[in-house]
Amino acid sequence: IWELKKDVYVVELDWYPDAPGEMVVLTCDTPEEDGITWTLDQSSEVLGSGKTLTIQVKEFGDAGQYTCHKGGEVLSHSLLLLHKKEDGIWSTDILKDQKEPKNKTFLRCEAKNYSGRFTCWWLTTISTDLTFSVKSSRGSSDPQGVTCGAATLSAERVRGDNKEYEYSVECQEDSACPAAEESLPIEVMVDAVHKLKYENYTSSFFIRDIIKPDPPKNLQLKPLKNSRQVEVSWEYPDTWSTPHSYFSLTFCVQVQGKSKREKKDRVFTDKTSATVICRKNASISVRAQDRYYSSSWSEWASVPCS
Amino acid sequence: RNLPVATPDPGMFPCLHHSQNLLRAVSNMLQKARQTLEFYPCTSEEIDHEDITKDKTSTVEACLPLELTKNESCLNSRETSFITNGSCLASRKTSFMMALCLSSIYEDLKMYQVEFKTMNAKLLMDPKRQIFLDQNMLAVIDELMQALNFNSETVPQKSSLEEPDFYKTKIKLCILLHAFRIRAVTIDRVMSYLNAS
């Protein structure tokens, strides 16, 4: 058993049929010595008396808010949560496996630049009685500070018969140099509590590996005389690290119709302009990627050909 | 004000072309190592990230773009103990810091070159003959060093009398290649920045 936060405790249980469970001793936070009784949640049934209560925690029915009283007055609370371990593996029932970039990916994180600011998100089908808390650091043995905000519900989607909820959090490394060469990864730890179930999820990454620039901005077309070719120009996104001659991007320019199966024109360039062939009912799209370290491509920025 | 993003002809700044070749060569070599040593811990997640130049050179600090010198987090330890001549310097007006930067890059390359050559000598003794260093990568390191053209004492190649542990050598190769790729990215950024300046 360990303390998650004040008056909230996590009991780690091996979860299998007829498991013996864990013996837990609760102590009432009071100077009083006698006349103390214990109850669980909203029940008025007295579970025991005295300053300490010893319980055998085996299942969720044994978890919850234990309260010690004296003469009708509440003295203190202890909330017990369960963390299940099945076949030596901690449970991951609360969050959905996003399976990208690999199986057992519960947290996904992205950074728009090298400033040390990043966003992580996760998915769940649970809509109520759910809380998250997020901690982060650079390295684990001698951790350096990363400050994370509160996790918030950022999107709701319908997937078949289920509703899916996306939560996200923004974090900022306390003293980040955009030009630094990372040797210690960022660690992100998410504590998830659903009713009386506790789970924790972690992710470890270098900022350079989670870079995904914003799409290029200000796409403009200029038809070329006596040709089917069009000159398309754009600018670096505002959120990208500066100076741009140091943090350079490379671009992919594509002309395509509505369907992915349609024919297309595609060209890669390090410049902020390119010449392509425009077709009726097609769109010109441009996306960006770090020129020197191949992490993710940005989303497409698009303009119609006509 | 941002510096221009269009890349002029590599001839304007001879080291730019070499640094691009360097990044390409080390990336290819790392990819080859990952594939060939697939049953060894050779991915970014599996290895310890070590920097053999730590406390010996300070390329990131010495080559910091002017725009980032206002960022206190970038100014931990600006070393200033480097040699100051070199043929990549575009004009006599080149700042003292630029000379420090280029000489720091040269020192990095020299250290990695020695490590890679020592390692290759060990790998050539491996009866499995599983992996060797790409000669192209070693040649590209040499070309960039020549383009930088700094006078510096030659570092003797380490020779080891004991029987090499090939498993450890291959893991060390992965660690070295990951670190060198990260440094090659920094070098490429620096050359691009200097070229635009």
């Epitope: 199966r261 024919k263 024109d265 890669f268 062939i277 | -």
Partner: antibody, heavy 118, light 107 residues
Amino acid sequence: QVQLVQSGAEVKKPGSSVKVSCKASGGTFSDYYLHWVRQAPGQGLEWMGWIDPENGDTEYAPKFQGRVTITADESTSTAYMELSSLRSEDTAVYYCARNKELRYFDVWGQGTLVTVSS
Amino acid sequence: DIVMTQSPLSLPVTPGEPASISCRASQSISINLHWYQQKPGQAPRLLIYFASQSISGVPSRFSGSGSGTDFTLTISSLQPEDFATYACQQSNSFPLTFGQGTKVEIK
């Protein structure tokens, strides 16, 4: 299986024209760009131009501009390349090639040898 | 026009040995570079597109690398069927242009 089948070899006199055909099978004809590339004996490949069979748009290499005409007939899934004012240096194997991507070629015809000789 | 220069023009290789062919562009073409294999009396066959992207059905011993002006096609271990002419092609701008070809011959 996508295939491009070209017309047979031709022998032409200098100053005349030649029209080579390229019939496509497998896949929808208008879903692909179609190009013509030639190769003189013992020489490298030389791109001549392309056509979008969907709308008839064409683009030619400046070297052949005014001498080459590429057309397409959607009803027969056939593309044509006509080269006029032939000279002896036009002796080459002429290939049609296609792709959904405009700028490179993933399927090629078997080639048509055009010999220009007096 | 962008001029593509291949080297060497002829490459004698022992079967089972690796081979590397270089292609250089007269100006920077990013990764807009494609490789073809051509055997005598046959049409070219696409091997690699956009400098390093492999084509399904092409053996994994063929790989491409490079960007900007310098590109390489590598055959990790030459098989008897690999003795042919290899050509690079740029797609950075029209007109599309090819290298003159490199003939890989049995040593």
